[in-house]
Amino acid sequence: VPEKSVRWCAVSEHEATKCQSFRDHMKSVLPSNGPSVACVKKASHLDCIRAIAANEADAVTLDAGLVYDAYLAPNNLKPVVAEFYGSKEDPQTFYYAVAVVKKDSDFQMNQLRGRKSCHTGLGRSAGWNIPIGLLYCDLPEPRKPLEKAVANFFSGSCVPCADGTDFPQLCQLCPGCGCSTLNQYFSYSGAFKCLKDGAGDVAFVKHSTIFENLANKADRDQYELLCLDNTRKSVDEYKDCHLARVPSHTVVARSVGGKEDLIWELLNQAQEHFGKDKSKEFQLFSSPHGKDLLFKDSAHGFLKVPPRMDAKMYLGYEYITAIRNLREGTCPEAPTDECKPVKWCALSHHERLKCDEWSVNSAGKIECESAETTEDCIAKIMNGEADAMSLDGGFVYIAGMCGLVPVLAENYNTPNPNCENTAEEGYFAVAVVKSSSDLTWDNLKGKKSCHTAVGRTAGWNIPMGLLYSKINHCRFDEFFSEGCAPGSEKNSSLCKLCMGPSPNLCEPNNKEGYYGYTGAFRCLVEKGDVAFVKHQTVPQNTGGKNPDAWAKNLKEEDYELLCLDGSRKSVQEPANCHLARAPNHAVVARKDKADCVQTLLLDQQRMFGSSVTDCSSNFCLFESKTKDLLFRDDTVCLAKLHDRNTYEKYLGEEYVKAVTNLRKCSTSPLLEACTF
């Protein structure tokens, strides 16, 4: 097979015919050294998935349910290109499955038992698989056959296409459960009509259904959405209140050696030449031979799926939970309202050791999961492999953009017993230099810089945000002669100063000696001209407070702070000489786990928090000999957030704006995936 050939998988005679036409037309418009199409015919989409996994084909377009099958081992395929609908300016690649209710009703998601339900049809995504998958563990046992369990859960339903003879309750609201538009309650509009008419109490539909059926806002205001956290929201807040986000139609390929760049090159060229209203002789999104061949007829074009986005992230935690529940039919033994152990995400093996010790001391209430980078940890929390971790503000922003929520804040200044209920203002991000140097904020160009890590608040977002507004470009590696900013491209000058050791050189975790606050300060001590850190870093690592060989003889007076007005001040004066105020680090979790995480952590800090005085013979949660493992070592307590429970409210408008501006310079593959 030529290197530049994409073997498209077709699942019927009609698809094979369209594929051949696709191949011939692409040949006519692409240069001979460009990508080409070859066609492989298989009996079903599942056969196509297997063929791609076995390297007998390269690509196929799948519905969400099949993307799930494609992702499962041993197939291990991943989404590479998404079809979009709507306009090019506002492309829709996902729809949201929602539960709609009338505003004047008073129940929540966890009170659906005994209500009347309206569904689009048996086995359909938004109308059945997702809601029933998410409710699966609340269904009465035995849960098989599923239809019987659902019939016994709701007091009456309309489930078009269900067997009304075997399961009459499923057809109670629409006698016969007709499987076409002859049934007034069939499909999306029908399920909504079932609710509107008062036949049912809840309708499981798409987010767009209510807008398509009620043009008038005043009419829409009579309805609300049920959210998974047992609250309600208005129907236009579907992005924050849905059962699952469902990808519409997606091209998948192998995770390794999958030709994703070639597939994108091919489809991007294809949409240019044969997309909507582009050509008379061949149309990518329609066919005389049948409906939805190779691609959906309703598609308007393609978007490249960001490389960091694997199938788990693409399908989303809720969707995967729903489908897995339905497919595997397994439920936790513990009642669902009981808190299971919280899985903490630890960065590399140093944090993992501390986490293990915590786990032993917590009697198993804490379990540990590891990842090599903060972004990998955030991804694990998103997909349910982990539950929580404490993050610098810069990563609270990324986590928030990825749907996670802040749960508790680290407090550094408030003494107990008021600590747990106090909202601190934050800490100062500072620029530290040696007293012996003549550096100021205005002559940093060409100097050697030390950063905690790319994407972190004091070490990156604040100083680089200020620098960006001065130099108006993102080439920070050209501004400084060299530096250490863990998480930079390995060949960048901002990795040149890092210490490693070798395979971990410039990695954004504790295996890199110059990572984090203490690491950035060490970089200044040993090699650099300026370090961007928190205001407490110098005092915490001088005067013998850090016993490590490189730090034990350091004196506080040998270091000074750079002020934005071009002056310098003592490290004792951060309030009058700082770059900006930074939000305290905070614990983040998935929304569904936030309450459990908060309850457990407040309990854990009562046992292992700063009230423990002898850390040499007791486990201490906020101690790791200046290395800030799991939490900052200067944490006094974890504090409740009260109403600051979203990332925007927690970080504050000013900081969010600063980080949003810096996104032009973003090197965060995760952020790119989460904003897709």
């Epitope: 140093h350 944090e351 010790e357 032993v360 040499s616 013979s617 007791n618 486990f619 790791s624 290395k627």
Partner: nanobody, 117 residues
Framework: EVQLVECGGGLVQPGGSLRLSCAAS????????MAWYRQAPGQQRELVAG???????KYADSVKGRFTISRDNAKNTLYLQMNSLKPEDTAVYYC???????????WGQGTQVTVSS
């Protein structure tokens, strides 16, 4: 700083038992948490079992019901009783008291456990 030395490993058939010991050079009575880790070739080192001074224990899911951790403060020794051994238990086993901090990559020689027929 207490030095720890592991012993008791060996070759055993699937279904067999072994008892690992970890002798400390000084008193372990003041040490809060002690644990056994293992590392199979090409794998990350993983927690097998841990025990606190008060006797609270924690086990990896893969060894629950088969392994038992205990400590004898009078003898300054940590133990791991391993029953119903499986081939996947093959690894070098290490003990730690976490006292060197989490940052220093100090581990003893460990003791090799091989489960094979």
């Amino acid at each position: 700083e207490v030095q720890l030395v592991e012993c008791g490993g060996g070759l055993v058939q699937p279904g067999g038992s072994l008892r690992l010991s970890c002798a400390a050079s000084g008193s372990i009575a003041g040490i809060n948490t002690m644990a056994w880790y293992r590392q199979a070739p090409g794998q990350q080192r993983e927690l097998v079992a841990g025990i606190t001074r008060s006797g609270s224990t924690k086990y990896a899911d893969s060894v629950k019901g088969r392994f038992t951790i205990s400590r004898d403060n009078a003898k300054n020794t940590l133990y791991l009783q391993m029953n119903s051994l499986k081939p996947e238990d093959t690894a070098v086993y290490y003990c730690t008291d976490y006292s060197r901090g989490y940052y220093q990559d100090y581990w003893g020689q460990g003791t090799q456990v091989t489960v094979s027929s």
